[in-house]
């Protein structure tokens, strides 16, 4: 029988009445154009909704936007358009919400062509009040908040000026001209690229990378011949043009650009690209595109300095620059990532790693599923997950995979079971152990979301017809109840719940369509009365993460330590609550070869834990660049995985000697850098 229809599924008692009393409808009295929704702050209940409309094919002769505010998680909304003087707000800039709980909001207005500059509306009290400010420039990008100080804003102008405000947008100062890209770093530092000759496009590969640590009083040129740059974790990356040809290489800095090292990654040509897939303070996942229009490349994982890289996964699917990749960080379990590879036969297959890219494997076939037509052997196949690429290909996949850090072990995704991703209509699968095992959760495509740290999962069927039914589960997707939230079906456009999955409120967004008009409508359902009591100690059970062999003393060891979690029992129907904190007990493991990546010049043959020398480097001295000096590496092929906490056990030797020679290939050596003050 289909999931959730088994006889033993326990029913939640009287849920219809409980939910009916907690279902709140709001019809937005405006024409249906686009709608955007933003949460202001954490646990504040404040939501801002901006609806915008303008007549298609007519250049802004008629447009309106309306601003609505809720302070009860979307149950009620108040039209606050008058607070922004009924001004048309530019949706392409969205609503710039300040970091943390600053309560700051910036809206960018549409202004008439002849005006001297743009206009913004600013709030620092969670959108209770707004101040109109006319800008001395026309913004090209959304206002960007400094992560450290929400009073500091930066923006680029349509004339490529870099503008900074130190008083939350009240006053603005142009600190540099001819700027292509600007980003906040740590400690209120701004990194930006500049062009000298024509434009950002014309000077691509000849840009300069600058840094200011005092909001534009003084500057330092920290790189030349720059193609692009990026920040990830504690790493600053620059893609730099080679001196002699059109290739470029990645350089890395861990000291805000004062010193650079060339990453031991392949160089790329004009048509290729690098992409930082994921980064934290320990390491980086880097994708390097293959030459030619292959649609794939190679994933490399870095050491703790971001310099030495190991090949992690071949034929990694990534279509074009700024294109689609299925690379997904499974946030509900440490070390787990899912992505897709393009096979030799051009089929797409899903791979998963449980040890931060050390080893990749196929996803285990769900026990309650049959292999589909793509499978050569009907008894042996895997689960393949639909993510960004499938969505971009307009397959019937309404949502990417979902996981939440505080819903430990839970991963929900659309997928198909076979030898490769299928173009047939997918089903929804769930894992409760971080991706080791999977179960079919719902038949056909659905929208889904996690509430109350995993205590409730909500789903809505993906349909072209109007809907009025929501499904929910209180046991991690094993059993489902259905609730009719409105008599009159609506055209569904999306589910919205507060980021962080701690809320018990879900908003169903859609529109009503009549012969006369079309209006936005939201239904907010509060599940608090379904989970009547607070969870107690007896509702939780101990769970060892990454456990595959309970007999083994090292069972659960990943990246040098194991973790035991307290997890809610599936049978417990209770509230984790907004203040729920994941309880975990770590313990250190002995080191084994699994705790080491293959060093520069070494690789791991498939199904082998030993690292062997790359044939093309056999007998060569292993030399690489570090801080603009040449280093000699003495290694037996292993290096500790960044973030690995193991102690004792296996301990391979690794030594780095300074050859006291300058690297001719390092384009970002310190003597090429200079400073200046305003």
């Amino acid at each position: 029988s289909a999931p959730g229809e088994d006889e033993e599924c326990g029913r939640v008692r009287d849920f219809v009445a409980k939910l009916a009393n907690n279902t709140h409808q709001h019809v937005f009295d405006d024409l249906r154009g686009s709608v955007s929704l933003s949460w202001v702050g954490d646990s504040t209940g404040v939501i801002l909704v901006l609806t915008t409309f303008h007549v298609p094919l007519v250049i802004m002769t008629f447009g309106q936007s309306k601003l609505y505010r809720s302070e009860d998680y979307g149950k009620n909304f108040k039209d606050i358009t008058d607070l922004i003087n009924n001004t048309f707000i530019r949706t392409e800039f969205g609503m710039a919400i300040g970091p943390e709980n600053s309560g700051k909001v910036v809206l960018t207005a549409e202004v008439s062509g002849g005006s001297r500059g743009g206009r913004i509306f600013r709030s620092s009290d969670f959108a209770k009040n707004f101040v109109q400010t006319d800008l001395p420039f026309h913004p090209l990008t959304q206002m960007m908040y400094s992560p450290q100080n929400s009073d500091y804003l930066l923006a680029l102008s349509t004339e490529n000026g870099l503008w900074v405000s130190k008083n939350f947008g009240g006053k603005w100062e142009e600190i540099h001209k001819a700027v292509c890209l600007a980003k906040w770093g740590s400690d209120n530092t701004i990194f930006f690229t500049t062009y000298a000759n024509g434009s950002c496009k014309a000077d691509l590969g000849a840009l300069e990378l600058w840094r200011t640590s005092d909001l534009g009083k003084s500057f330092k040129t920290i790189g030349v011949k720059i193609y692009s740059f990026g920040l990830g974790g504690r790493f600053l990356f620059a893609s730099v043009m080679a001196d002699k040809d059109t290739t470029r290489r990645i350089h890395v800095s861990t000291d805000q650009g004062d010193t650079w090292s060339m990453a031991q990654l392949p160089s790329v040509g004009q048509e290729q690209f690098y992409s930082i897939l994921a980064a934290n303070d320990d390491m980086v996942f880097m994708h390097v595109d293959e030459p030619g229009d292959t649609g794939f490349g190679t994933i490399f994982t870095s050491d703790d300095r971001g310099i030495v890289y190991s090949k992690s996964l071949d034929r990694h699917l990534y279509t074009t620059t700024g294109g689609e990749t299925d690379f997904t960080n499974v946030t509900s379990l440490r070390g787990v990532y899912i992505t897709s590879v393009l096979s030799e036969d051009n089929s797409i297959q899903t791979m998963i790693t449980f040890d931060q890219g050390g080893r990749w494997t196929h996803l285990r076939k769900p026990e309650n599923s049959e292999c589909d037509a793509t499978a050569k052997n009907k008894n042996e196949c895997s689960l393949h997950i639909h993510a960004s690429y499938s969505i971009s290909q307009k397959l019937n996949v309404p949502m990417a995979p979902l996981s939440e850090p505080n819903a430990v072990g839970i991963v929900i995704a659309h997928g198909s079971v076979g030898d490769a991703i299928s173009v047939m209509v997918p089903d929804v699968y769930i894992s409760d152990d971080g991706g080791y095992s999977w179960t079919k959760m719902l038949e056909g495509p659905h929208y889904y979301t996690i509430l109350d740290s995993g205590g409730i999962i909500v789903a809505i069927e993906h349909s072209s017809r109007p809907i009025n039914v929501i499904k929910f589960s209180t046991d991690e997707g094993q059993c489902w109840q259905t609730y009719t939230f409105t008599r009159d079906p609506i055209y569904f456009t999306g589910l919205a719940s507060e980021p962080g999955a701690r809320s018990m409120n879900i908003s169903i967004w859609g529109f009503t369509e009549s012969f006369l008009t079309s209006q936005w409508v939201s239904y907010t359902i509060d599940f608090k009365d379904i989970l009547e009591r607070n969870c107690e100690e007896k509702d939780y059970t101990i769970w060892l993460a990454h456990s595959t062999d309970p007999e083994d003393y090292e069972d659960g060891c990943i990246l040098g330590y194991k973790e035991q979690f307290l997890r809610l029992r599936k049978s417990s129907v209770c509230q984790n609550g907004r203040d729920y904190v994941v309880t975990k007990q770590p313990s250190i493991c002995l080191c084994s070869l699994e705790d080491f990546l293959c060093d520069f010049g070494y690789y791991r043959p498939e199904n082998d834990s030993k690292c062997v020398e790359q044939p093309e480097l056999k007998g060569h001295d292993l030399e690489f660049c570090l801080y603009g000096r040449e280093e000699h590496l003495t290694t037996n092929g292993y290096r500790k995985i960044p973030g690995d906490k193991c102690q004792g056990g296996v301990n391979p030797v690794r030594e780095v000697k300074d050859l006291k020679k300058k690297c001719t290939s390092n384009f970002l050596s310190p003597e090429k850098q200079n400073s200046k003050s305003n």
Epitope: D30, L31, V55, E513, S514, F515, T517
Partner: antibody
Framework: EVQLVESGGGLVQPGRSLRLSCAAS????????MHWVRQAPGKGLEWVSG????????GYADSVKGRFTISRDNAKNSLYLQMNSLRAEDTALYYC????????????WGQGTMVTVSS | EIVLTQSPGTLSLSPGERATLSCRAS???????LAWYQQKPGQAPRLLIY???SRATGIPDRFSGSGSGTDFTLTISRLEPEDFAVYYC?????????FGGGTKVEIK
């Protein structure tokens, strides 16, 4: 060119029926609600009926409710008005009209088809 | 239903003069849903103004609309010979859609 062409009008006796058609071209017919508006000789405009893009929502003026039926065939880019139990006061020029946008006024009108109800 | 009352019923003016046409609603209408049409003898109506104040494509800028709530106005700043016609206001806010009775602008 965006165009609406009505047909099916004529002289009919009271109590009898008539079916009007409106052929649409030059725009994506299935994306828009459509309407019928009439104008009695020498009088003002009167909205008769409207139908949503997918036929899921339909409305009528009180004066025609229960007697007239609006329908559409998106595959044929056609709008219809089935008029039963016709009365002398239904005598008018019948226009089909397309809204400028969802919930908007009518930017495209046909040339009209004349319906005369007389014994 | 929302009743729209137009005044005056007839407006006699000379070319070059300013014409001011009024449309009053029996209950408040959101300006997004109010429109004005022009109709000449033997022709279908032509959309002039939508959203109470936005000119439709191809409409000269001598036509302007204003108003909110229950009172709306169509203004023709300088009458041209081709502007003499009947003008209707319309609301599309609620069903049934209704038109005003019309104002005839004739040559004095």
């Amino acid at each position: 060119e965006v165009q609406l062409v009505e047909s099916g009008g004529g002289l009919v006796q009271p109590g009898r029926s008539l079916r009007l058609s409106c052929a649409a071209s030059g725009f994506t017919f299935g994306d828009y609600a459509m309407h019928w508006v009439r104008q009695a000789p020498g009088k003002g405009l009167e909205w008769v009926s409207g139908i949503s893009w997918n036929s899921g929502s339909i409305g009528y003026a009180d004066s025609v409710k229960g007697r007239f039926t609006i329908s559409r065939d998106n595959a044929k880019n056609s709008l219809y008005l089935q008029m039963n139990s016709l009365r002398a006061e239904d005598t008018a020029l019948y226009y089909c009209a397309k809204p400028l946008y969802r919930g908007g006024p009518f930017d495209i009108w046909g040339q009209g088809t004349m319906v005369t109800v007389s014994s | 239903e929302i009743v729209l009352t137009q005044s005056p019923g007839t407006l006699s003016l000379s070319p070059g003069e300013r014409a001011t046409l009024s449309c009053r609603a029996s209950q408040s209408v959101s300006s997004s849903y109010l429109a004005w049409y022009q109709q000449k003898p033997g022709q279908a109506p032509r959309l002039l103004i939508y959203g109470a104040s936005s000119r439709a494509t191809g409409i000269p800028d001598r036509f302007s609309g204003s108003g909110s709530g229950t009172d709306f106005t169509l203004t023709i700043s300088r009458l041209e010979p081709e502007d003499f016609a009947v003008y209707y206001c319309q609301q599309v806010a609620v069903s049934p859609i209704t038109f005003g009775g019309g104002t005839k602008v004739e040559i004095k």
